[in-house]
């Protein structure tokens, strides 16, 4: 599976985990059909993927949620892919927004985010949502990952 | 296009094909602007992409569909990316769900799925939907592919 | 960041730019947290990514838009990923469609497109939408990129 000792494959795919925390940062787990190629990428505190090597990474997240227009705030459901680099401000890399459904009790929708970004050693990426209680954690619905180019 | 004889590029992108079959598994074809890098990945029976080499793959699917809330079941439209490995359970890798539109005669919506997964030699991936008759087969709307890292 | 002098990494990620032009082709900029790996991929005229080397590329786009059913045409909002190759017809590679929301003044929705395609030297890819005035240009909402396998 190695490209060579100096250039091992680096990839991760983690699975959403329901959380009692009120934080807007989604929680993830190495469970089910997950991927964690080696220790050059790690899942930290169940909330962020952290890389040890600088380079270009394709980073993606998929979030499925169930919401209703009447029961939700006016604002849409927003999922954000964010970056934390040592000694720098946190940044938004990608965002997606979906207006709440009129279906009752709630209408399911899925969001997919993905892009190529340069990460520094020790950089972490995480996923924020406007309302984590609306996120669907059924098999395959919500996941998060990356691969090093 | 080779990374080297021992490590050729492996990638595929296939195009949706309307089918008279009542199966929930979508049908695909090597037509239009498709990709099939070599015989290390093949489209089998028009329904699954099968790989010959073990490794990490980024697998994706896009499904556009047109549905109406009144004419459809209560359940949302669900697209599933699934895995078949020799001697193992079939597995759901990824799913996305979208509630039906209230637009008439139907409202179009697009779903995108993608993630990194380890595949065994002989493993196949395929796409399931709740109602294949709702899928849009116009140019570029529905496609399926993978690339080996 | 090099795979070797003969095989450098090629990747780009550009950020949407509001435009006063009435063209349906989206405009992009190298701003914010953008990626432009080297001069083997370039952003031309703020509208297309052009590659110098033949090969397989994973190309993606994300478009967030805000529309209302009553204020829009009957037709859905469609985003298209298109290809221009020297001496050939332009082609649609990928499309996604979303019916307009009934939310007022408008309802936000996000579309993600992505797939693997063979590009010729000098080939350009660009993104078309049915109504560019509906596109959301807030941080992270709309972006476009590629990576060479």
């Amino acid at each position: 599976m190695q490209k060579g000792d100096q250039n091992p494959q680096i990839a991760a795919h983690v699975i959403s985990e329901a959380s009692s925390k009120t934080t807007s940062v989604l929680q993830w787990a190495e469970k089910g059909y997950y991927t964690m190629s080696n220790n050059l990428v790690t899942l930290e505190n169940g909330k962020q993927l952290t890389v040890k090597r600088q380079g270009l990474y394709y980073i993606y997240a998929q979030v499925t949620f169930c919401s209703n227009r009447e029961a939700s705030s006016q604002a849409p459901f927003i999922a954000s892919l964010c970056l934390k680099s040592p000694g720098r401000f946190e940044r938004i890399l990608l965002r997606a927004a979906n207006t709440h459904s009129s279906a009752k009790p709630c209408g399911q929708q899925s969001i997919h985010l993905g892009g190529v970004f340069e990460l520094q050693p020790g950089a972490s990426v995480f996923v924020n949502v406007t309302d984590p209680s609306q996120v669907s954690h059924g098999t395959g619905f919500t996941s998060f990952g990356l691969l090093k180019l | 296009m080779q990374k080297g004889d021992q490590n050729p590029q492996i990638a595929a992108h296939v195009i949706s094909e309307a089918s008279s079959k009542t199966t929930s598994v979508l049908q695909w074809a090597e037509k239009g602007y498709y990709t099939m890098s070599n015989n290390l990945v093949t489209l089998e029976n028009g329904k699954q992409l099968t790989v010959k080499r073990q490794g990490l793959y980024y697998i994706y699917a896009q499904v556009t569909f047109c549905s109406n809330r009144e004419a459809s079941s209560q359940a949302p439209f669900i697209a599933s990316l699934c895995l078949k490995s020799p001697g193992r359970f079939e597995r759901i890798l990824l799913r996305a769900a979208n509630t039906h539109s209230s637009a008439k005669p139907c409202g179009q919506q697009s779903i995108h799925l993608g993630g990194v997964f380890e595949l065994q030699p002989g493993a196949s991936v395929f796409v399931n939907v709740t109602d294949p008759s709702q899928v849009s087969h116009g140019t570029g709307f529905t496609s399926f592919g993978l690339l080996k890292l | 960041m090099q795979k070797g002098d003969q095989n450098p990494q090629i990747a780009a990620h550009v950020i949407s730019e509001a435009s006063s032009k009435t063209t349906s082709v989206l405009q992009w900029a190298e701003k914010g947290y953008y990626t432009m790996s080297n001069n083997l991929v370039t952003l031309e005229n703020g509208k297309q990514l052009t590659v110098k080397r033949q090969g397989l590329y994973y190309i993606y786009a994300q478009v967030t838009f805000c529309s209302n059913r009553e204020a829009s045409s009957q037709a859905p909002f469609i985003a298209s990923l298109c290809l221009k190759s020297p001496g050939r017809f332009e082609r649609i590679l990928l499309r996604a469609a979303n019916t307009h929301s009934s939310a007022k003044p408008c309802g936000q929705q996000s579309i993600h497109l992505g797939g693997v395609f063979e590009l010729q030297p000098g080939a350009s890819v660009f993104v078309n939408v049915t109504d560019p005035s509906q596109v959301s240009h807030g941080t992270g909402f709309t972006s476009f990129g590629l990576l060479k396998l």
């Epitope: 059924g138 098999t139 | 359970f89 | -």
Partner: nanobody
Framework: EVQLVESGGGLVQPGGSLRLSCAAS????????MGWFRQAPGKEREFVAV????????LYADSVKGRFTISADNSKNTAYLQMNSLKPEDTAVYYC????????????????WGQGTLVTVSS
């Protein structure tokens, strides 16, 4: 390790129905995937159906789709396979299996197997 005990096999006429049960013990039922394989005489073991006990998501082999239904009762730690419109080609030993994960790659999942129950479809 998960212990699995199947029941419900037997002889049935073509077009008839049977319901197989698989009782599991050994760890929390909702932490693994349950399903069925079958092996006909002289053939390889093949996948039939699977259910994710955490949320009820399921998949079926093409050959049984629309005829067989897999379900699970988490309170009883039991999975079921309802088989309708049975055909002679459904004749096989049916094995219940549970898939669990250790640490490391998700490919390193392990299967625990029941002893098998014979289903014969014949007139």
């Amino acid at each position: 390790e998960v212990q699995l005990v199947e029941s419900g096999g037997g002889l049935v006429q073509p077009g008839g129905s049977l319901r197989l049960s698989c009782a599991a013990s050994g760890r929390s039922f909702s932490t693994y995937t349950m399903g069925w394989f079958r092996q006909a005489p002289g053939k390889e073991r093949e996948f039939v159906a699977v259910i994710y006990t955490s949320d009820g998501a399921n998949l079926y082999a093409d050959s049984v789709k629309g005829r067989f239904t897999i379900s699970a009762d988490n309170s009883k730690n039991t999975a079921y396979l309802q088989m309708n419109s049975l055909k002679p080609e459904d004749t096989a030993v049916y094995y219940c299996a549970a898939e669990t994960y250790g640490s490391g790659s998700s490919l390193m999942s392990e299967y625990d197997w029941g002893q098998g129950t014979l289903v014969t479809v014949s007139s």
